[in-house]
């Protein structure tokens, strides 16, 4: 009588994530009775993956009708593939017996699995920094296979060169992850940028798979003070200006000082923003030189985004003005930027 | 599913010509598609692809020579400007469904000869 | 630009030998390499995908091997359908190109 041969026509089969997956195999003969099982791996530790007589297994359908009388197609189709799915599959047939033995096993089937990364997704620096820092972006992707595949950086469009990249695991595994960090430095201009993490996989058709952060949740561009004295009103007031310019995020608190004491506290708000995406904002303060008997020294201090207030002191000189309505003379400026 | 490949004819040196693939079966927002090229007795020489979203990447040596377009059930490749050696048999083909990698579905070719 | 070498450039073999190909890549394209086959003014055909996976419907007299720089495509028992010119083809993953070997005639002896 002829030897039984299990037939396993694929060496391998590949098949994409989420599909269906055929895995072929026939018996020679019907001779002796026993029921075929499939098999991953070899050896003690393999796993069952299919047993028509008993077992749930609800990925796994026969392809034949394994119960039709002179059956000997064994194949199976397992749906809905993932990377763990990947690995050799054995069609092993059996004698029947007390317990069944093992009778031939098929060369195997290597089923491999193709995967697409994930999105990538980029996070920034818990923290914003001030222009003229360098600030980490990092990226990552998961659940890719084969191993290979490319990552770029790009700011407004310029690929970037300070990145660190790494695919894990390093060994064979079912399914990858990459992370990579860019290092990028920023500038006061950088309010409107945006970094792009760009991901390129066999599995992609072409067009490579983006992850995007804004600079400006990382960016912190501190303001410049300015300030000037208008000319003397008629009723011997004096309009002093603190223009508060170039700055973001547009989280600000201004406070004028009068010789150092408190005289108004203000909240930047609904500001509108320069083409740049930076913020200005003008504080008047109002000064009645009659009421004073000494010059006056003013303060414009500036509270930027919970950092340390940043001043610029300015003196009026009382001095300098006649009591009498009408006077037009020209106050001095004495101030410097200071930091508290 | 088939790729039919139309446009080629007898065209002089310096002149443009325009080569079209028309696909049936599945959709060209899909899949990588490619042009190819074969001189008479020699090998296939890849030209370039359009990605499925409509971007075109060329093989180094085509310079600017060729474009590559796409509308929902067309390819096209534009020559700018033919020469002698473009004289070929082109081919349109679709990479497989599970990667860019290869190709598993090429239209039959249409021929191209450049000649004054 | 990666270069693919194929060898021989020709050979003559009879119904039901044995035939093998080869085909080395200038640099490491891991198992992203294609075979096809090419008969007179037909179109390529897919047989051998990832170096080493059939595609479906050809015959399983038709196998690939190999990775890194080195494939083979063998075709275990020549069948007189199978006198054709065969094309290995790479695709490298960073950048993205495609490139061909020069061809090898499988003639009948």
């Known amino acids: 009588e002829e030897e039984l041969q299990v037939i396993q026509p694929e060496k391998s089969v590949s098949v994409a994530a989420g599909d269906s997956a055929t895995l072929n195999c026939t018996v020679s003969s019907l001779i002796p009775v026993g029921p075929i099982q499939w098999f991953r791996g070899a050896g003690p530790g393999r796993e069952l993956i299919y047993n028509l007589k008993e077992g749930h297994f609800p990925r796994v359908t026969a392809v034949s009708d394994p119960t039709k009388r002179n059956n000997m197609d064994f194949s199976i189709r397992i749906s809905n593939i993932t990377p763990a799915d990947a690995g050799t599959y054995y069609c092993v047939k059996f004698r029947k017996g007390s317990p069944d033995v093992e009778l031939k096993s098929g060369a195997g089937t290597e089923l491999s699995v193709r995967a697409k990364p994930s999105a990538p997704v980029v996070s920034g620096p818990a923290v914003r920094a001030t222009a003229e820092h360098t600030v980490s972006f990092t990226c990552e992707s998961h659940g890719f296979s084969p191993r290979d595949i490319t990552l770029k950086w790009f700011k407004n469009g310029n690929e970037l060169s300070d990145v660190q990249t790494n695919v894990d695991p390093a060994g064979k595994s079912v399914s990858y992850s990459i992370r990579s960090t860019a290092r990028v430095l920023l500038t006061r201009r950088d309010v409107h940028s945006q970094v792009i993490c760009e991901v390129a996989h066999v599995t992609l058709q072409g067009d490579p798979l983006r992850g995007t952060a804004n600079l400006s949740e990382a960016i912190r561009v501190p303001p410049f003070l300015e300030v000037t004295q208008q000319s003397m009103r008629a009723d011997n007031q004096v309009n002093v200006t603190c223009q508060v310019t170039k700055f973001y995020p547009q989280r600000l608190q201004l406070t004028w000082l009068e010789n150092g004491n408190v005289s108004r506290t203000e909240m930047a708000s609904a500001l509108p923003e320069n083409k740049d995406g930076t913020y200005n904002w003008t504080s008047w303060l109002l000064v009645n030189v009659s009421a004073h008997r000494d010059d006056v020294k003013l303060t414009c201090q500036v509270e930027h985004d919970g950092q340390p207030a940043v001043n610029k002191s300015f003196s009026v000189k009382v001095s300098a003005h006649p009591k009498e309505q009408g006077s037009n003379t020209a106050a001095e400026n004495t101030g410097t930027n200071e930091r508290n | 599913v088939q790729l039919v490949e139309s446009g080629g004819r007898l065209g002089q040196p310096g002149t443009p010509l325009t080569l079209s693939c028309t696909v049936s079966g599945f959709s060209l927002s899909s899949y990588v598609m490619g042009w190819f090229r074969q001189a008479p007795g020699k090998g296939l020489e890849y030209i370039g692809i359009?990605?499925?979203?409509?971007s075109p990447y060329y093989a180094s040596w085509v310079n600017g020579r060729f474009t590559i377009s796409k509308t929902s059930t067309t390819m096209d490749l534009k020559m700018n400007s033919l020469r002698s050696e473009d004289t070929a048999t082109y081919f349109c083909a679709r990479v497989g469904p599970l990667g860019v990698d290869y190709f598993n579905i090429w239209g039959p070719g249409t021929l191209v000869t450049v000649s004054s | 630009d990666i270069q693919m070498t194929q060898s021989p450039s020709s050979l003559s073999a009879s119904v039901g030998d044995r035939v093998t190909i080869t085909c080395r890549a200038s640099?490491?394209?891991?198992?992203?390499l294609a075979w096809y086959q090419q008969k007179p003014g037909k179109a390529p055909k897919l047989l051998i995908y990832s170096a080493s996976f059939l595609y479906s419907g050809v015959p399983s007299r038709f196998s690939g091997s190999g990775s890194g720089t080195d494939f083979t495509l063998t075709i275990s028992s020549l069948q007189p359908e199978d006198f054709a010119t065969y094309y290995c083809?790479?695709?490298?993953?960073?950048?993205?190109?495609?490139?061909f070997g020069q061809g090898t005639k499988v003639e009948i002896k």
């Open positions: 083809q790479s695709w490298h993953y960073i950048s993205r190109s495609y490139t």
């Open positions: 359009i990605s499925s979203s409509g």
């Open positions: 640099q490491s394209i891991n198992s992203y």
